[in-house]
Interface confidence: low
């Protein structure tokens, strides 16, 4: 499988078929394939180096492994875009031989010397062809060079197997399937041939192809694939139950955002809350988590305007549970990414230079910001996309809360809604989906770069839109709700994950 | 109730070392982040050093950096700073504290740095 | 590094005065300030974090203020017993830094 390993190398060689027998909409498939995957691998802050080939009667070099921008996954795609089926419309047979060898001159040394840690570094080869190889001799002799050139099955004792990797995509209206089965690897319990069919379904095929073992700790990652659970899909999602004797129970969401804790609104537990009367579960798992503690932020008092006939007032509506026991990543259970961390900066690919300010810009501009949350509705969790109105339209987003039951008679709307604040909901530029009673406590997320990042707590919402959990189709414009901006709440998070190996900016 | 009692204070010559370890108790010493502060002579407060709650951890401003290694040892509930290279400017009383902030320090251990 | 300005090393005040000691940071420190007590002969004692919260058991005639650079401890109803030296301390980044300190005395 495709190892993808942060801190190893690897050196990946995209080969697509451009013969005649191919066809012009099937080489496009192929194209876009390839440039989804590009995408998937350097969502996991992997960088690789990319050889670039296409071939008919002869190969095209378009990007070699040596080159300096080769590891930059947005200069790769670009040269992959710009190639277009008529490249090789002259000479339209098709020698995957001569293309296979142009792969091992790539991974071939000056003067057959190997650099130090050749030996590290893992070589992947996607070939994209219907197996229809009219010209020059078996490409499978070209395979056998390279697992040569490798130093693979050569040795009992190391026989180097994972250093290289053959996945074969059958592609065109006629796919030669014993001719394509020949190249590709076989490696017990993996899969490295693939049908057009497969590739309806990306997500599925990227799914048996990549090994995620060594970075299941990347934070704003999922799975989309079809076989996948509400959890694959968020797997960062928490639901959290206070039992309260005589009193029924709360429900709330959150987040994993560390090994350790669970970010949630701090509204969903009172002082009286026993450790114990608290049920954390996450990944979908029947089982509760032991909590050691909740942490509130130190602002946080929801009784703090009573006084001034505010009967609760939610800024720094924030809390951290604290797990007894470290948590097991996996597939469905996995951190969700926190601003102003080196984890974000590596998932939003900007330069290890970034700023706590330039995260801010990035994922916070001053306009209506595309963001979702996630939402359990008759058990299944759906992702609500919503628009954080933080430009033009934030004002009147934010003036909406007097309509908020007990505080009508607030006079100045900034008594409750303070700079802690990010307004979603309404109907411009689009019908917000509200959260219910139930989402309090979750993330409010922005989508980028195929990554989740955590921009905002759940808070508290103008109208009850949900009842019996039900949403109403039918919601009033002002119904707005309100999440704490977690942006102003970092030097809490900061200090309380100061052990989480988060890398805080 | 939470107490910390640094001791290995004593009067060095420059260019020396010492250890300091601070004795910690009332509390679950592996939850929390730990520092040295030191008050000089003329009175200033000097943050000197802090280490994580699991230890992975260590931070220093400059004027300590290279010279001064905080550590810890969470089945004895012991903090440690190892001073080497000491200097004159390093005369003070040192306290350990728990935290960040400090919410919590200990009575000091006085340190002199002379010839 | 962030230094905290306390621009008064001494305030004299009378028993039942309400005083207010400043502080001001170099850069903008958010909330992450705390006031510790340090009377003579003892260690620093905190009294206030994240510029505005009482730590356990300190009076609450000790009141915090401030964020971004500008920072103020009150004391109303001053008691003979708060007289003593307060340091200001910024947590928001490394080095950690304090004030000079300020002494409160009887007038």
């Known amino acids: 499988k495709i190892v993808l390993d942060p801190s190893g190398s690897m050196n990946i060689y995209l080969v697509l078929d451009g013969s005649d027998s191919i066809g012009a909409s099937n080489f496009t498939g192929a194209k876009k394939c390839l440039v989804n995957l590009i995408e998937k691998v350097a969502s996991y802050g992997v960088k690789p180096r990319y050889g670039l080939v296409t071939y008919a009667t002869y190969p095209k070099i378009w990007v070699k492994v040596s080159e300096a921008d080769s590891s930059n996954a947005d200069w790769v795609t670009k040269q992959l875009n710009e190639i277009n089926y008529e490249d090789h419309k002259l000479k339209s047979g098709t020698n995957t031989k001569k293309a296979l060898q142009a792969v091992y001159s790539m991974m071939s040394w000056p003067d057959d010397v190997p650099p130090e840690g050749w030996n590290r570094t893992r070589h992947v080869i996607i070939l994209m062809t219907d197996g229809l190889h009219n010209m020059g001799g078996d490409p499978i002799t070209v395979i056998d060079e390279i697992r040569d050139l490798l130093y693979i099955g050569k040795d009992r004792k190391n026989p180097r197997e994972d250093y290289l990797d053959v996945y074969v995509f059958g592609v065109g209206p006629l796919v030669n399937q014993v001719n394509i089965n020949a190249l590709a690897s076989k490696k017990d319990n993996e899969q490295h041939v693939f049908k057009v069919k497969d590739m309806e379904n990306l997500e599925d095929v990227f799914y048996q192809m990549i090994d995620e073992s060594q970075s299941l700790s990347l934070c704003g990652m999922v799975w989309e694939h079809r076989k996948g659970t509400d959890y694959h899909k968020q797997p960062w999602q928490a639901k959290i139950s206070v039992i309260r004797p005589s009193k029924g129970h709360e429900s709330c969401m959150g987040a994993v955002v560390s090994e350790y804790f669970v970010l949630t609104a701090a509204h969903c537990f009172t002082v009286d809350d026993k450790e114990h009367s608290i049920k954390v579960s996450v990944g979908g798992e029947k089982r509760d988590l032991e909590i050691e503690v909740v942490l509130f932020h130190p602002n946080y008092n929801i009784n703090g305007k009573k006084e001034a006939g505010i009967p609760e007032f939610y800024d720094y509506d924030v809390a951290l549970i604290k797990l007894k026991n470290k948590l097991k990543y996996g597939q469905t259970i996995r951190p969700i990414c926190l601003p102003c961390t080196e984890g974000t900066t590596r998932a939003l690919r900007l330069p290890p230079t970034t700023t706590c300010q330039q995260q801010k810009e990035e994922l916070l501009p001053a306009q209506d910001i595309k963001a979702l949350f996630v939402s359990e509705e008759e058990k299944k969790l759906t992702r609500k996309e919503v628009y954080i109105k933080n430009g033009d339209k934030k004002g009147s987003c934010e003036r909406d809360a007097q309509y908020a039951p007990g505080y009508d008679k607030v006079k100045d709307i900034s008594e409750v809604v303070t700079p802690r604040f990010l307004c979603t909901g309404g109907v411009s530029p689009y019908a917000d989906p509200n959260t219910c009673r139930g989402d309090s406590g979750g993330p409010l997320i922005v989508h980028k770069r195929s990554r989740f990042i955590q921009v905002g707590v759940i808070s508290w919402g103008v109208v009850d839109v949900c009842k019996n959990q039900k949403r109403q189709k039918q919601v009033p414009a002002h119904a707005r709700d309100f999440h704490i901006n977690l942006f102003q709440v970092l030097p809490w998070l900061k200090e309380k994950l100061q052990d989480e190996d988060l890398g805080f900016l | 109730e939470v107490q910390l009692v640094e001791s290995g204070g004593a009067l060095v010559k420059p260019g020396g070392s010492l250890k300091l370890s601070c004795a910690a108790s009332?509390?679950?010493?592996?939850?929390?982040?730990m520092s040295w502060v030191r008050q000089t002579p003329e009175k200033r407060l000097e943050w000197v050093a802090t280490?994580?709650?699991?230890?992975?951890?260590?931070y220093y401003p400059d004027s300590v950096k290279g010279r001064f290694t905080i550590s810890r040892d969470n089945a004895k509930n012991t903090l440690y700073l190892q001073m080497s290279s000491l200097r004159s400017e390093d005369t003070a009383l040192y306290y350990c504290?728990?935290?960040?902030?400090?919410?919590?320090w200990g009575q000091g251990t006085s340190v002199t740095v002379s010839s | 590094d962030i230094v905290m300005t306390q621009s008064h090393k001494f305030m004299s005040t009378s028993v039942g005065d309400r005083v207010s000691i400043t502080c001001k940071a170099s850069?903008?420190?958010?909330?992450?300030v705390a006031w510790y007590q340090q009377k003579p002969g003892q260690s620093p004692k905190l009294l206030i974090y994240?510029?505005?919260t009482r730590h356990t058991g300190v009076p609450d005639r000790f009141t915090g203020s401030g964020s971004g650079t500008d920072f103020t401890l009150t004391i109303t109803n001053v008691q003979s017993e708060d007289l003593a030296v307060y340091f200001c301390?910024?947590?928001?980044?490394?080095?950690?830094?304090f004030g000079a300190g300020t002494k409160l005395e009887l007038k």
């Open positions: 301390h910024q947590h928001s980044s490394n080095p950690l830094t």
């Open positions: 009332g509390f679950t010493f592996s939850n929390y982040a």
């Open positions: 850069q903008d420190v958010g909330t992450a």
């Open positions: 994240w510029a505005s």
């Open positions: 504290a728990r935290e960040r902030p400090m919410d919590y």
């Open positions: 280490i994580s709650n699991r230890g992975s951890y260590t």
